[in-house]
Structure formats: C-alpha cells, structure tokens
C-alpha cells in the first residue's frame, strides 16, 4: 500500500489551532508537476457534506512529502470530509478523514467501519442532544433510511446493513429531521472487496494474517498497519510517537501522538495513534490494553508486562506476541518484511536463524507462494546465528506474494513470512519527442509513458543514422531532463529509441519503438548586400541586391526581405523563392512611411546573416478630396460640375480626375482628366439625353488623392444619342456667364 497518512489535530477548543497534515513516506512524493512524482493534494471535499462558505483554507507545503491545511475560523469549518491524495500512476491513493462536530445532536460511536464483503455492518449514532423527531440516515448525501425517535435503543440509533458489498462503501450520516446537517453524526463505511482473510481478483488468495489490528488490502494482499506498527504482518511496534510504514515519521509536539487522529489508505480508515483512544484521541489506554484506539489486549504470559504502545514486553528468555515462546525455540532473525526483484532475475535470498540447539543448513527452508520448497545452497555459521543462502530460479510474475522462511530444530520451529514483489522492467510505450533541431544536433525529450513498473532510475537514448547498420550510439541521461544529441550530420535522418531501467539487477527494460528525427540543412553563410532601390509609387518599392562570389554551389533556397516600420512597430516580410533572384518589387506599402530594409539568404528553415540595413522613405499619399462637388444639367448632352479645392494641401495640385458612370449601369466608369488644377468647374459633354449619371472626382499631387462625394444628375430632353462624354473646363464665372 502507498505510505500515506492524514493526521488530524483534534484540539477542538480552538478551531484556529486545528490543522490537517498529509505525510507521504513514498520515494519522490510530492515533487511536483513532472511525470515522475505528482504533488500531494489536501482538500476539503464538499460534495457530500456542505458547510457554509468561509474564508479559504491555507495550504502549506513542508518539504516534498508533507502538506498542511490550516485557517479554520469556526467549528463548522471543521465538519465534513477531508481527503489527501498521493502516490503516482496506478498507486495514486486517496486517504479520507471524516470530522464530526463535538456539539452535534448525534455522535458516532465509531466513525470508521471496515467490514468484509457479505458482512453485516452496524452504524451506531449516540444521542447527545435529544430531539423528539425522526432520524434520517443518508448514504453519500442521498436519502437512505428513516427511524422514528422512539426506535432509539439505549440512547442510540442503529442502522443495520446486512450483506454489504463494495458499492455500499461511503459516507453515512444520521440527522434529526429539521436539524442542521452540521449536527449530524458522520460515518465512513469501507467494504473490502473480499470475504474475511481473502484477497485478489477472485478473492482466491489468502491474507498473511495481519497482526495488531492491521487490515489486509483486498487488491494486493498487503497489511495496512495501524499507526505505530510496521512489518509485513504489522508484527513490529514502532517506538512511542512514531508512525509511517517504516516508523520513519514522528508525531509533532511534546505530547507525542495524543490528540491526533490518523487516517491511512483504505481499507484501514482512521484511528487514534497507538496508545490512545476516545473521540478526541486524548485518553491513554486502560491497563492491559494497547495499540491504535486501545483495541488490543495484551494477555502477557511468563512475566511479560503490558506497554500501551507496543504490547507485551517480555522478560529475558521469552519472546512472542504474548511472551509465550521460549528463547530455546529457534527464531528467524532480522528478516526483511518486503523484498523487491525484477522479472526473470535469479536472486539470492538470505535467511538467518538462531536457537538452541543451533540451526544448521538443512534445518532452514524457503517456501514460495505456490508451495514450492527451496533448500539452501550454502550456509554461513556464526557464533550467534546461521545464515542460509537460497538461489532462486528465474522469477516469474506468479512469484509475487508471500514467501516464508521456516526453521525447524528439536527445540521447536519458527517461520517468518515476507512479501516478494516481482517488478516488470519498464518498456516505453511511445517514441521520444523531438523538441528542436539544428544542422548538427537534435534536442529530444526522453520522458515517455511506459508499461511495467517504476520508479525509473536511468534513461538510455540509442541513436544511429537511418538505414545504417553501424552500432547504435548510446547516451545515459537523467529521467527528468531533455537530451541534446550532438556532432550529428546535417540533413540526415536518425533513428532514435528510448530504453528505461528501474532499480535493481535486471532492471533494464526492452527498447521502445523507434522514431525518425532529421537534422536540419546547413545554415546559409553568405551575407547579401543591398545594391539599390527606387520608389515606383507611393506604395511600391523596387529593391535589388547582390551576393559575394564563392566557389561551389550556392547553399540557399531563396531570399527573405524584411521591412521594418519603426513608427508603427510592424514588420513586413517578403519571401523571394528563387536563389537566383536579385531584384523584387514590394507592393502594398504604406505611403509616407520611413522603412528600414534588409535582405537575407535562407536554406530550409534556417536564415543566413542579414545585409546591412538601408533606410527608405516612401512619398506620402495623394491630397484630400475636393469639397462640395455639385452637378447641374445644362442640356440634353451636357452637365456642369463645380467644386471647391481640397483643404490642407501638402503641395500644388497637378490635375483633377473626374469619374463618370451611368446610374445603375454595369459598364466600367470613365475617367476624365482636368489638367488645369486652378479650375473649380468643368462641363462634361457628349452625354446621352434623359440619362441619369453619377460623378465623383479626386485631385493628384505626386499621387492620386481621396475621392469626393458622389453626385447624381440627369441630362435634359430627348436629343440625339451622343458619341460619349467629353470634358470642357472653364473658370466657374465663365461657365455661369454662358
């Protein structure tokens, strides 16, 4: 099981001193956002028990494996469900703590109930403040059952759940009808996926017989040990005030684990620390009792004394849970509770024993989970013990499980079970990812998803040119860093594969799938220079350039021209896709703009050095529109136009241009120049009779200006069809005289 503990500090007189701490004993726990160690998460779960919103809780990380939640301002902030999530990948585990208000109408006799599949669970809510009304039971926030207030038994409301199944697991609550939900008794029911003493997919495997209140995990058969106990079967007590799978953590504060609730991964749930009991874990065990919640009885024999933290302390000459075993009986010594090997390895396992008479090589045997017995190949005899060494045949996955070392002498026998985990070396499921490439190097991310078991100790990157039969080059890298493959050939495809390893002998996995990564072309090295440029209009620029003469073929695919408009902070890029080109026309530029211009050679996606920049000023655009354009029919073929000169002219007008179009006509408009810029009137002749025309005009200085407003006018009468409009211009006064 994942080594994850959620600690609740139950000093309830002052909610501001209340805190929850989640502690992980996992290697690399909580390291953060990389794929090798997701962070610890600690939060209040408001999906089932909703409390009034308050100020946000404060989360503080203390190193890589601890996170603390504080900032509770009032007792109601504490009521409800809290969860801590830790562990990586398939081992990601959620630990849940349920907090009850000590002032609630109903209080749970026991908060966490762990039962086996098919058992009957009984939840008991004790009346703390009586109300003469129905009691509503809920499961995961939804209605479940109702009891009449007369149905209380000895001041308790009982909910019987016969033949429970795993889906029955969850948060249960008992509430008086019309009472605040915060006054409810909250419970946590954990239903193991198997019957008592069984585990595994079909519940076919036998649990190791967890001691000291440990609970057998229905998925992996491991004992989840109560706080303060360790070992494969929870057979060993930690020193007072310590907890964690290896007793590596220490309770904070001078009073040790007093006032702390410990929550562990399911199917354990929550309890007080070893040596403490009561709803707030502040009462020491009564004489003769020990362990978490003081649930265990010592029953020491042969003069043993009861320690409320560890159980029986045996006098010299005796050992065993109840001091029932004489030291003359052989005893397995210092056997590791858990060993880990890689698949298909052939490890050596040692088992040491002592006793009177002294154990010899033949009296120590090793039993595999399938019942196969291995005899030791050699033994080392020392004054105080005999160590037998066993050569294990090639390991298969079925060898995972509980192995047993057994010693038998005429003085008796002893055995010690230990867990063997056969791990599958990791195999990448995907190819490495190309991050960036250059002509002679590739930057690769080796982090890929994998099958098999972690943690990843080393990553090897194998690479060689595509279709090559030469040996693979190999680089060993840190799992969390990107790799740069250097000294490669330009414009060459390389086959790249990842190989992952986990700790231990035989931990190297098979190579992952290959991927093709291609180095970039050689960088173009020639620097062009600008020969010249000339303006072909207010928005058009012709540019020419040259390249130095060098022997051999030109390394380049084309040219990139860049125009930088510093005023507007805009860059215009023009791609010339022929490496032979030495001139280009740039159009659609902004009139009156000062540009910085340069040119550079490109090859594939790589740019060569830019030419020294040139500075170009485009002429401004044309003048503003003429004002107050007016049309007046003079005859059946003539219309007179009058206007006023544009305002704020940047220079002298060179001419006006009139646009003539038949209203609603589909043909192209006709443009007529008025070459005498001082004029403010002109007559358009040769128009058709009784025809409606549209007119607009613009002035020209260096370039054409903006169009005026459009005016409409119809010719008079019904004269002959004209050949087409022509223009005659006069001073306005002269036209009026006529």
């Amino acid at each position: 099981a994942v080594d994850l503990t959620l600690l609740a500090n139950l000093r309830l007189t002052d909610p501001q001193r209340f805190f929850l701490t989640c502690v992980s004993g996992e290697a690399g726990a909580g390291r953060g956002s990389d794929a090798w160690g997701p962070p610890l998460l600690l939060e209040k779960d408001d999906r089932i028990v909703r409390t009034p919103p308050g100020p946000p809780l404060r989360l503080a990380r203390n190193g890589s494996h601890q996170v603390t939640l504080r900032g509770f301002s009032k007792p109601s902030d504490l009521v409800g469900v809290f969860s801590c999530v830790g562990g990586a990948g398939a081992r990601r585990t959620r630990v849940i703590y349920v907090h009850n208000s000590p002032g609630a109408h109903l209080l749970p006799d026991k908060v966490t109930h762990t039962v086996n599949k098919g058992d009957t669970a009984v939840l008991s809510a004790r009346v703390h403040k009586e109300k003469q009304t129905d009691v509503i039971w809920k499961s995961n926030g939804s209605y479940f059952y109702t009891l009449d207030w007369h149905e209380a038994q000895d001041g308790r409301f009982l909910l019987q759940l016969p033949n429970v199944q795993p889906p029955s697991s969850g948060i249960y609550s008992a509430t008086y009808l019309e009472a605040s939900p915060l006054g409810s008794a909250f419970f946590r029911l954990i239903v193991r996926g198997c019957g008592a003493g069984r585990w595994g997919p079909g519940c076919t495997k036998e649990c190791p017989g967890c001691l000291h209140g440990g609970v057998c995990h229905d998925h992996d058969g491991e004992c989840v040990c109560p706080p303060g106990f360790t070992g494969t079967r929870c057979e060993q007590a930690c020193r007072e005030g310590r907890f964690g799978q290896s007793c590596q953590e220490q309770c904070p504060g001078i009073s040790g684990c007093r006032g702390l609730t410990f929550c562990l991964p399911d199917p354990y749930g929550c309890s007080c620390g070893s040596g403490w009991r009561g709803s707030q874990c502040q009462e020491a065990c009564a004489p003769g009792h020990f362990g978490a919640d003081c649930r265990l009885q010592c029953q020491c024999q042969n003069g043993g004394t009861c320690d409320r933290f560890s159980g029986c302390v045996c006098p010299s000459g005796w050992h065993g849970v109840h001091c029932e075993k004489s030291d003359r009986i052989p005893q397995i010594l210092n056997m590791a509770s858990e060993l880990e090997f890689n698949l298909e390895t052939m490890p050596r396992i040692n088992c040491a024993a002592a006793g009177n008479p002294f154990p010899v090589r033949g009296s120590i045997e090793l039993r595999k989970p399938d019942g196969t017995v291995l005899l030791s190949t050699k033994a080392i005899v020392e004054p105080e013990k005999t160590t037998a060494e066993f050569e294990v045949p090639r390991l298969v996955l079925a060898d995972s499980g509980f192995w047993e070392c057994r010693v038998s002498t005429s003085g008796g026998q002893d055995s010690r079970r230990f867990k063997v985990n056969v791990k599958v070396p990791p195999v990448p499921l995907a190819a490495p990812r190309l991050l960036t490439k250059q002509s002679r190097q590739l930057v690769v991310s080796p982090l890929v998803s994998f099958s098999g078991d972690g943690p990843i100790s080393t990553v090897r990157l194998h690479y060689r040119p595509q279709d090559s039969t030469m040996d693979w080059s190999t680089i060993v890298v840190d799992p969390s860093e990107n790799v740069t493959l250097m000294n490669l050939r330009p414009k060459t495809g390389y086959s790249v594969r990842v190989q992952l390893s986990r700790p231990g002998e035989g931990g190297e996995g098979a190579w992952g799938p290959p991927t093709l990564m291609t180095t970039d072309c050689p960088e173009p090295l020639l620097q062009p220079w600008l020969e010249g440029w000339h303006v072909e209009g207010t928005d058009r620029l012709r540019v020419s350039w040259s390249l130095p003469l060098v022997p051999g073929p030109l390394v380049g695919d084309g040219f990139l021209l860049r125009l930088w408009d510093g005023t507007r902070g805009q860059e215009r890029r023009e791609n010339v896709s022929s490496p032979q080109a030495r001139t280009a026309l740039l159009t659609g530029l902004t009139p009156g703009t000062h540009y910085q211009l340069d040119v550079q050679l490109y090859h594939c996606t790589l740019l060569g050095p830019a030419s020294p920049p040139a500075h170009v000023l485009l002429p401004p655009s044309g003048p503003p529109a003429p004002r107050h354009l007016h049309a007046q029919a003079l005859s059946d073929s003539e219309i007179q136009l009058t206007w006023k000169h544009p305002e704020a002219l940047p220079g002298p007008i060179s001419k006006y241009v009139v646009e003539v179009q038949v209203a609603g006509g589909a043909g192209d408009p006709l443009w007529i120049d008025v070459d005498r810029p001082e004029e403010t009137s002109t007559i358009i002749r040769g128009l058709n009779a009784s025809t409606r025309y549209l007119f607009r005009m613009r002035a020209s200085i260096q370039g054409l200006g903006d169009w005026s407003n459009t005016v409409e006018e119809s010719t008079l009468g019904n004269g002959l069809q004209a050949e087409g409009p022509v223009q005659e211009s006069r001073a306005a006064e002269e036209g009026l005289d006529q």
Epitope: I136, H150, E151
Partner: antibody, heavy 119, light 107 residues
Framework: EVQLLESGGGLVQPGGSLRLSCAAS????????MAWVRQAPGKGLEWVSR????????YYADSVKGRFTISRDNSKNTLYLQMNSLRAEDTAVYYC????????????WGQGTMVTVSS | DIQMTQSPSSLSASVGDRVTIACRAS??????LNWYQQKPGRAPKVVIS???NLEAGVPSRFSGSRSGTYFTFTINSLQPEDVATYYC?????????FGQGTKLEIK
Amino acid sequence: EVQLLESGGGLVQPGGSLRLSCAASGFTFSHYIMAWVRQAPGKGLEWVSRIYPSGGKTYYADSVKGRFTISRDNSKNTLYLQMNSLRAEDTAVYYCARQGGGGRAFDIWGQGTMVTVSS
Amino acid sequence: DIQMTQSPSSLSASVGDRVTIACRASHDISDNLNWYQQKPGRAPKVVISDAFNLEAGVPSRFSGSRSGTYFTFTINSLQPEDVATYYCQQFNNVPYTFGQGTKLEIK
C-alpha cells in the same frame, strides 16, 4: 420506474373486514416510511396511517385506531392495511403513498383502490 | 389535532391570471406543510413541500410562502392544465391533516 399498485378493495358489509395490499417497485421499499391516505366520494383527503421502514413503529388517525392495522413485508416489497369492524363512513378510495426520503411529503402515490361499506 | 382551514373552497379564474390559495393552521407548524394537486379521477401529486420547496418537474409558476401559521399557494400565470383541486397538508404532528381542498376552474 417507481410505482405503487393497490389491490384488495371491494364491497363489504358494515362490521366486515378487508385487507388492502400495495405492491411497490422501482425503489428500495425497505428504506421508506409508507402510508395510507383515503378519499371519500366527492370529499377531501384524509390521512389514515403510516409505518416506519423497520415496521417497528406505526401511527393511526383517531377515526381508525383500534380497527385498522398497518403492516409491511419488506422481503415482498408490500404494504398492507387490515381493516376490521368497517363502517359506512370508511367508504373511500384508499391510496398507498410513499413518504419522501428525508421529508414528510407523500411523493409517490398509487392509483387507489375503492372500498365500499354498505349493507 | 391540528386543524387546517383552506380557503376558498372553489375559485374560477382566467388563463394568465395570478391565483392565490390560503391555508391556516390552528397551531404553529413551522414550515411543515405540503401542497398537493389532484386532477379529476387521478391520485394527488405533491407540488410544494416544506412550505416553499418546488418539487422536481413542477413549473416555476407555482410557489409557496408562509407568515406564521398562515400559508399561501400561488400560481403566477394560470394555465389550462392547472385545473385541479389543491390541498394543503401539515406534517408537524400525527395525525397528519389536510385542508378541505380548493377546486380551481377556468372561466
């Protein structure tokens, strides 16, 4: 589909007996308070009796106390009303109703069964 | 026993009208009151529970309110399908008691 189906109604003489049944489906019958409500022809609704999920606690209207008995068989998902010493004023449509989870509104009703007490 | 006095016993209104039915309890019953709708020849159906709570699937034009022991049931904009008899019911004390009912018709 959540459903209640009453049966057992009919014509009975004053002083006679009748047993009504109500078959429940579509929900966990054994978890809910159940009740009987009646409605005399052309009149309003009158609550008759209720029974808690365990069957251990029952309540009755004064007008039927001592004559009617409510019971349930959770293994058969069935509610019963045993009516003895029937009177003409017991003539009504009898509805079986579920009392909603956590509240006391009758959230599911049967279609009703007619009981006529007449000589 | 708690008496529930419902008024009026019948009322006629036009489509789109705002309709209000009242119910008075003889004792304090807190919010422990439900409103039911019964259409002719059908079983009753709960519309509002706990004096205010609109049941799932009930149109939002229905609402309930309370002032002391006086409860009101309102239909904001009467629709033809709202023709029915409406009952209030207290569940504060056993025996649970219903009002006499209000028969609602369309003009």
